[in-house]
Every structure is written in C-alpha cells, then in structure tokens.
C-alpha cells in the first residue's frame, strides 16, 4: 500500500507512519513504531511546552530578572511560560517584556492622558486652552484654569498651558 503522505490532527509523519504528537506539557522520547505508541515524558520543573509537539526538549520558563525591573506576573506551568511584568513605576520595553524602563513624566504644559501600566508607557497630551499643568508628573492631568468669576474676582493675569490664571479684586468705580 501507499505510505501516508499526510496525517490526522495531533499526529506527525515519520518513517512513512503517522505517530501521535506529545500533548502540551510533555516532550518526545521516542517516535512510534509499527507496534508501539509514541513515547512522551512530562517536562521537568521550570520547563514547558505549550502545544501538541514532537520536541525532544522542553523550553525553559522565562526568568523575570529583578535587576531589569522585572517580576513574575503569572507563574509558568508545564504547559505555559512564565509571564513577566515590571515593578511599580516601570513598564515593559517590548511585548515580550524582556526589560523595563521608568514611566515617562509629562512635562509642564502637558497632562497625563493615560496612566502607564506594567506594559505601556504614560501617554501625555498638550493642555488645551483653558487648562494647564505646571509640574512634571506621571499622574497629573491638565487642570482647568481657575474661574475668577465664580469667586467674584477678575482675571489679573491670563493663564497659559503651564500656568493658572491670576485672579484679583474687581476695580470699584467711585462716584
């Protein structure tokens, strides 16, 4: 008979035979034969394989290096890799989160649009007219100018994107 050229899902072709793949969390020890099934063994401590596979070695769990600002977000299993994230005040430099950088601060004239997370940096936006920020901060949004009118005061000095308005008393007309 013709040897198979393709195998079913969760099988692989070797020596003209379809062998079962090893399940996630296990590695290949020996291929199946005409009379025996594929031999698989569980991955060791700190190892994983996350797919049906014919790998002869399991992958090492990712190491979350504290010297790079990393910490474990989710511990790895025999079927999943460890997920790293960054320490408070830091965020990942890439999707793989192999190192961390300090969250950026928004300069005066800019406010925080989106606070940084373990995986994304601070997003700043320029303070629009009517708003200001006079500090460099990773948390502060643009604040609205003070409304002098509500305090029964008048604007003595116009506000900018970096400074609030300065209010003062209204000039009184004498009779």
């Amino acid at each position: 008979p013709e040897p198979p050229t393709a195998c079913r899902e969760k099988q692989y072709l070797i020596n003209s035979q379809c062998c079962s793949l090893c399940q996630p969390g296990q590695k290949l020890v020996s291929d199946c034969t005409e009379f025996t099934e594929t031999e698989c063994l569980p991955c060791g401590e700190s190892e994983f394989l996350d797919t049906w596979n014919r790998e002869t070695h399991c992958h090492q769990h990712k190491y979350c290096d504290p010297n790079l600002g990393l910490r474990v977000q989710q511990k790895g299993t025999s079927e999943t890799d460890t997920i790293c994230t960054c320490e408070e005040g830091w965020h990942c430099t890439s999707e793989a989160c192999e190192s961390c950088v300090l969250h950026r601060s928004c300069s005066p004239g800019f406010g925080v649009k989106q606070i940084a997370t373990g995986v994304s940096d601070t997003i700043c936006e320029p303070c629009p007219v009517g708003f200001f920020s006079n500090v460099s901060s990773a948390f502060e949004k643009c604040h609205p100018w003070t409304s002098c009118e509500t305090k029964d005061l008048v604007v003595q000095q116009a506000g900018t994107n970096k400074t609030d308005v300065v209010c003062g008393p209204q000039d009184r007309l004498r009779a």
């Epitope: 008979p1 199946c32 034969t33 009379f35 025996t36 099934e37 031999e39």
Partner: antibody, heavy 113, light 107 residues
Framework: LVQPGGSLSLSCAAS????????MSWVRQPPGKALEWLGF??????????EFSASVKGRFTISRDNSQSILYLQMNALRAEDSATYYC??????????????WGTGTTVTVSS | DIQMTQTTSSLSASLGDRVTISCRAS??????LNWYQQKPDGTVKLLIY???RLHSGVPSRFSGSGSGTDYSLTISNLEQEDIATYFC?????????FGGGSKLEMK
Amino acid sequence: LVQPGGSLSLSCAASGFTFSDYYMSWVRQPPGKALEWLGFIRNKANGYTTEFSASVKGRFTISRDNSQSILYLQMNALRAEDSATYYCARYGGLRQGWYFDVWGTGTTVTVSS
Amino acid sequence: DIQMTQTTSSLSASLGDRVTISCRASQDIRNYLNWYQQKPDGTVKLLIYYTSRLHSGVPSRFSGSGSGTDYSLTISNLEQEDIATYFCQQGKTLPWTFGGGSKLEMK
C-alpha cells in the same frame, strides 16, 4: 521426521475471522524449552510483507493463501536445533499493545538423521 | 535483542492460594508485556496484554502489573484448571522474545 539439510512445509488453516485483515505469525517451542518467535506476515493493508528472527532468516519463508485462509511456513536447510513444536498464531492489537491472541494447536517437527 | 527472564522456573501452590509469577526485561519495555498460559497438552492462550489488560474470556482472578523492566502475573484464587506453564513476552521491539516459562504445580 526430516533429515538435516532437508526441507519441510507447514500449513495452518484459520477460520472464524477475516484472515486477510490480520498479521499471522509462527512460534516454535523446542522440547522442554521456551517459546521462540520465528516471524510474521503482515496483513493486506500492509502488503503481506514479512519479518523474521535472526535464527531462521534466509532459511524459512512465510506465505499465505488469503482466499483459503491458510498460513504457510516453508523451512529449508533444516538443522537438529529446529526440532520443536511449531505453532501458528494470530498477531493482533493496537499501538497500545500487540499480542498473539489466537494460537494453533501446534505440530511437532523432528530433524534427525 | 531484549532478554526476558522468569527467575522462577517452577513453583507449587495449593487450591485457593494467591500466586505471583515475575518476569524481568533486559531493558525498559514500556508496558509492552504479555502473559500466556500453556496447558500440559500444549494448548496456548493469551491471558494479559499490555501489562494489565485482561484478554476477553479470561477469568478476573488473573491480573498483571509492573512497569519499566519488572512485571508480574498474579492468580488471586488458584483453581485446578490453572495448572500450566506461564510465559511472559515483550512486544516492544523485534524480535519478539519470551521468558523461559514458570511451571505451576499443585502441592
């Protein structure tokens, strides 16, 4: 009884199952000794190809007549140490374990001058 | 070739006894181990395959266990009809090989 250097053919008639679907094997047992696997012939799906143990390779052949459900063992260049009871056996199973699940009654072969 | 060793070539027991027969392989055979019974008249039957799976029609007093290189056949409540020779056989690697047999007799 057969002389050393001589030839002999054994046959084994099967019934009660679809003969061509199964691997068929020959096993022998010298008097007072252990069983010894000699060889098998694969089923139709696997092209009726054969495998043999080193002790008989090149001297013994296995064939089958699937229309009559008969298994054959052709033995050539016989030696005294080939004296034994010869069994035919059906070889079945899955990759989770193959086994000889149906055995013939056995036939005695004596090689002597 | 894989060598199969049955250290006990003969043993005697009484009716109702629990009997265990051992078999050792020269290398790991991954549970590809079968047990056969040969009656005094030469009739051979499969009892257990893949270490512990009972062949159809075999009484439940027969059981098998083991792993790696060491395997055993147990007859839990010996009956007269169990008087026979028992052979182990590895099915992992060609050539298939048998143990030397363990002859069970009645006391």
